[in-house]
């Protein structure tokens, strides 16, 4: 068989169009000029190439840009992006939010792939911080994005970006992540009035210290049980019965249903039974009357 390397007569591609879907792989390799492909990348996404054909097109671009594709090509990759490996993407320098959006759109509706994770990492590192527009974009495509970051990575989120965060974006965050995000949220929302402030800060309270919970208890916030159950146990333990009652308002009755679960269970063990009885909820397990409570942690700190 003749070695099929030369482009057959009359088949040299003058533009990237639908006729190319009829080309065999070797014909694409031989008849499509890589520079033409690069300048007409925006047309590729409109053409229903097979995966095998896309492999050929990718190979041509790889040969043309061995050090990594320029952003003008990256922005128009379309579904050819799905053919890229994390190693390919690490060679890129993506600075435009429009480019990021275009590529995230290709992967829309799917789990975050290693390619997308690498792309986001490259983009954020290039910007130096996770600014509001970027965060807006990323959480729109991947609501769980914020909670996929390590506490160290979250530390680069400026407080101004916190305005872009929706409650559902924090659903899968663990306490370590909320510990980092809470102070930023507190700073971001500091100029809001009481009730508005609570609505905004509520999702972040899993990172709040005791003194902030005490302050909130003085503001008639009526925290719901779902939020209370997400609070740090160490932050809840020092709260008095009166403070928890003020913090929860009418929701205090929900403590009974949660008395076997943390942090309620641990908090009950720290309260005087007399004080718990004042709630009239039948909470059991408090410290019996007449017992002296020694705070060993305080004693250790003093010695």
């Amino acid at each position: 068989e003749v070695e099929k390397t030369a482009c057959p007569s009359g088949k040299k591609a003058r533009e990237i169009d639908e006729s190319l879907i009829f080309y065999k792989k070797w014909e694409l390799e031989a008849c499509v000029d890589a520079a033409l492909l690069a300048t007409q990348m925006d047309r590729v996404n409109a053409i229903p190439f097979t995966y095998e054909q896309l492999d050929v097109l990718k190979h041509k671009l790889d040969e043309l840009y061995p050090q990594g594709y320029p952003e003008s090509v990256i922005q128009h990759l379309g579904y050819l992006f799905l053919k890229m490996s994390p190693e390919d993407i690490r060679k890129w320098n993506v600075t435009s939010l429009e480019t990021l959006k275009a590529l995230l759109e290709v992967n829309k509706g799917h789990e975050m792939s290693p390619q997308v994770a690498t792309l986001i990492d490259r983009f954020v590192k290039g910007r130096g911080q996770l600014d509001k527009d970027t965060l807006d974009t990323l959480t729109a495509f991947y609501p769980g994005y914020l909670c996929s970051l390590s506490p160290e990575e979250l530390s680069s989120v400026p407080p101004s970006s916190i305005w872009a965060v929706r409650p559902q974006d924090l659903d899968t965050c663990d306490p370590r992540q909320l510990d980092v995000l809470y102070p930023k949220a507190r700073l971001a929302f500091q100029n809001m009035n009481g009730s508005e402030y609570f609505v905004k800060i509520q999702s972040f309270l899993g990172g709040a210290p005791t003194e902030d919970l005490k302050a909130l208890s003085q503001q008639n916030v009526s925290m719901d049980l779902a939020t209370f159950m997400k609070l740090r146990t160490d932050a809840v333990l020092p709260l008095t019965v009166a403070e928890v009652q003020k913090l929860l308002g009418p929701h205090v009755e929900g403590l009974k249903a949660e008395e076997r679960h943390r942090p309620v269970r641990d908090w009950i063990l720290r309260q005087r039974q007399d004080d718990l009885d004042t709630l009239g909820l039948g909470l059991q397990g408090g410290i019996p009357n007449g017992y002296l409570v020694l705070d060993l942690s305080m004693q250790e700190a003093l010695s």
Epitope: R43, A46, I47, P48, G78
Partner: nanobody, 117 residues
């Protein structure tokens, strides 16, 4: 958005003919192309014929000389005249629309063509 609807499929004897239609509705812009594809059970999808907004046509090797693609620009409809049908032409036939201005493609739901021997 562009919606595509295929029609005209059915059961036909080998050697017979069928005419498929693909109607496009919605935001139709030039330049564009409309393409017929087919997928037989257990096989990969393959392009059958295409026609663009300038009227240029292309055909897959297996249908050249037997199938003819045409287009009514006013009705935004593409046709596939299939003559001398063979059992190996049995497949689901899909049409797709390539919008080069927006860099997007749209697909129809497909129509079944069965050629009995």
């Amino acid at each position: 958005q562009v919606q595509l609807g295929e029609s005209g499929g059915g059961l036909v004897q080998a050697g017979g003919s069928l005419r498929l239609s693909c109607a496009a509705s919605g935001s139709i812009f030039s330049p564009n192309a409309m393409i017929w594809h087919r997928q037989a059970p257990g096989k990969q999808r393959e392009p059958v014929a295409s026609i663009n907004s300038s009227g240029s046509t292309n055909y897959g090797d297996s249908v050249k000389g037997r199938f003819t693609v045409s287009r009514d620009i006013v009705k935004n409809t593409m046709y596939l005249q299939m003559n001398s049908l063979k059992p190996e032409d049995t497949a689901v036939y899909y049409c797709s629309y390539s919008d080069f201005r927006r860099g997007t493609q749209y697909w129809g739901q497909g129509t079944q063509v069965t050629v009995s021997s």
